[in-house]
Amino acid sequence: REVLVPEGPLYRVAGTAVSISCNVTGYEGPAQQNFEWFLYRPEAPDTALGIVSTKDTQFSYAVFKSRVVAGEVQVQRLQGDAVVLKIARLQAQDAGIYECHTPSTDTRYLGSYSGKVELRVLPDVLQVSAAPPGPRGRQAPTSPPRMTVHEGQELALGCLARTSTQKHTHLAVSFGRSVPEAPVGRSTLQEVVGIRSDLAVEAGAPYAERLAAGELRLGKEGTDRYRMVVGGAQAGDAGTYHCTAAEWIQDPDGSWAQIAEKRAVLAHVDVQTLSSQLAVTVGPGERRIGPGEPLELLCNVSGALPPAGRHAAYSVGWEMAPAGAPGPGRLVAQLDTEGVGSLGPGYEGRHIAMEKVASRTYRLRLEAARPGDAGTYRCLAKAYVRGSGTRLREAASARSRPLPVHVREEGVVLEAVAWLAGGTVYRGETASLLCNISVRGGPPGLRLAASWWVERPEDGELSSVPAQLVGGVGQDGVAELGVRPGGGPVSVELVGPRSHRLRLHSLGPEDEGVYHCAPSAWVQHADYSWYQAGSARSGPVTVYPYMHALDT
């Protein structure tokens, strides 16, 4: 028979729990063996004090009786031949030599019937407290402090953990978070990050990714100061933060045992989310302007927002929806997170400026408004946060209320009358088509353009192919030639201030078709851009190249 207990001496700390195992091998008799625990105190090394037994409930000496009855000291059977002695809260007088004895069930008295191990009780000298983390976040002078950090900003917390235990021990320090107002315990405390006794850094499951990405850091500064930094605070980082220090010692058998643990509340942390703060307003109110006049709109981004920089960035854009159109419409202009301005589709080539005029105020200026600029304008602001990497993450966006903009129409009315000079044309001749344009209204300096179009018959029917441009004269007086069905020469010209002519030289059968004239009125603004103020379409003019009698 052999009774086995751990190799000693064992060092444990007053006030903590201790477990000492005992098992028996090589015995005869029933599988379920009985165990008795005794203590030999240093001041009376020959006196065995009965602690607890698996067989006799009245076994305990007076010094242990009350603690056994209270369940603070107990023997727990693991199996028939193994038990563990558990002492919930060690006292200094619990130091001494512990003996595990197994009453004999053997036919012959052979081997050892007890095993001894020394337990030394160390004073509780582990200290844990909050340390000022440095100038990060706003801290209210309460205990524990309340801290408010902006989403995306750094959250830094410090912890002081030290021990003056005379033996060689190691400290493991971890930072944990519990949801605000929740009771703190192992089940409610979620580990954020910890530094093990071997100085390895480990993160709790939800934080492992952030640790790997460098967004979460934990370091030891000096002998007893630990600092945790959460790179880009997120809404889910709010809560009560704790620091837990655990003291570990290496037992003679080589295994490590935790001999003390203490926890301190570091801070109640509130994360001010950008989505709860970001607000966008526009001004001035509803605008009514004339064509060619400048349109200026202001956008103000407000809220308790972190400044643009290392942790946060902003983009601001203007959207325009034509009156009655659903959705955000189209993008007019945007200043991106790097301050680069861009004009949206349809606005390139126009004199439009989008600029930051104050720390949170942005201006959109259209140098010369057009009727097509009328609609509902909104300012859209987006807030981005950056972790400790360079990656930006969109954290919030807000749109202003709609701002109606009205641009008066020019009131230009065009009419066009077109005809074929001479009425009848023959193959090989030149067909002259004339277009007279009448204009009512419009500003001074109105320019006219006119283009000529043809629809060709296919098998005697007008084709479903859209009309083709034959040629025209732009508002700048420059002629543009399209495609002539017959492929011969074409000339377009202005023959009077309101009169345009199209000539088709050397007519062929392919030139047969229905032609029309399409005038348009153009206004040039101060920024030299043009916009179309009106358009019209003449009635159809049929061109049928007849054959001369000689052609038959």
Partner: antibody
Framework: EVQLVESGGGLVQPGGSLRLSCAAS????????MSWVRQAPGKGLEWVSG????????RYADSVKGRFTISRDNSKNTLYLQMNSLRAEDTAVYYC?????????????WGKGTTVTVSS | DIMLTQSPGTLSLSPGERATLSCRAS???????LAWYQQRPGQAPRLLIY???YRATGIPDRFSGSGSGTDFTLTISSLEPEDFAVYYC?????????FGGGTKVEIK
């Protein structure tokens, strides 16, 4: 009508050269950054090169750098792509495209494309 | 280079059904500089969406774009016969501009 029309494609031997042209009409050509995008048979789209409004700020995909040159003539409303040292993998339909906000908002007008075949 | 991964590769749906196409970037797309194109067989691409969520001129409102950061979505609320085509996403957050591999929307 806003329009882009490519030309200049054809069959060329490996190591040979081609010059593609793209004629623009219906818009103020000089107000836009322009790009060339290609599509190999049965494959996806690949951006090839881009050029700034005044002809500066040229950029190229790594696959064509040093072999292709993009240029433009704003007086003729025309974009060009000079392709030298052509390889079999350059076989594709080449599209000319108008970029919005220097391409930050994509390309809103595309030509019908011109086919370049590099084969011996 | 930013890699754009489109999924699924092929989407088999019937006219009238809703189509959801995904585009995932290998790194964050700043300022939502992402566009979507439609390409019908034998035709040039056509811009549908720019700035991740703005419809290009003349694009029907059954097309909508959403997303930010690395995950973007093109939704066609009710497929019309002419919507069966290949769809590409494209980024211009970083040089060079890159396209996704495309999603083919075919008739079931």
């Amino acid at each position: 009508e806003v329009q882009l029309v490519e030309s200049g494609g054809g069959l060329v031997q490996p190591g040979g050269s081609l010059r593609l042209s793209c004629a623009a009409s219906g818009f103020t050509f000089s107000s836009y950054r322009m790009s060339w995008v290609r599509q190999a048979p049965g494959k996806g789209l690949e951006w090839v090169s881009g050029i700034g409004r005044s002809g500066g700020r040229t950029r190229y995909a790594d696959s064509v750098k040093g072999r292709f040159t993009i240029s433009r003539d704003n007086s003729k409303n025309t974009l060009y792509l000079q392709m030298n040292s052509l390889r079999a993998e350059d076989t594709a339909v080449y599209y000319c495209a108008r970029a919005i906000a220097a391409g930050r908002y994509g390309m809103d007008v595309w030509g019908k494309g011109t086919t370049v075949t590099v084969s011996s | 280079d930013i890699m754009l991964t489109q999924s699924p590769g092929t989407l088999s749906l019937s006219p009238g059904e809703r189509a959801t196409l995904s585009c995932r970037a290998s790194q964050s797309i700043r300022n939502n500089y992402l566009a979507w194109y439609q390409q019908r067989p034998g035709q040039a691409p056509r811009l549908l969406i720019y700035g991740a969520s703005y419809r290009a001129t003349g694009i029907p409102d059954r097309f909508s774009g959403s997303g930010s950061g690395t995950d973007f979505t093109l939704t066609i609320s009710s497929l019309e016969p002419e919507d069966f085509a290949v769809y590409y996403c494209q980024q211009r957050s970083n040089w060079p501009p890159t396209f996704g591999g495309g999603t083919k929307v075919e008739i079931k």
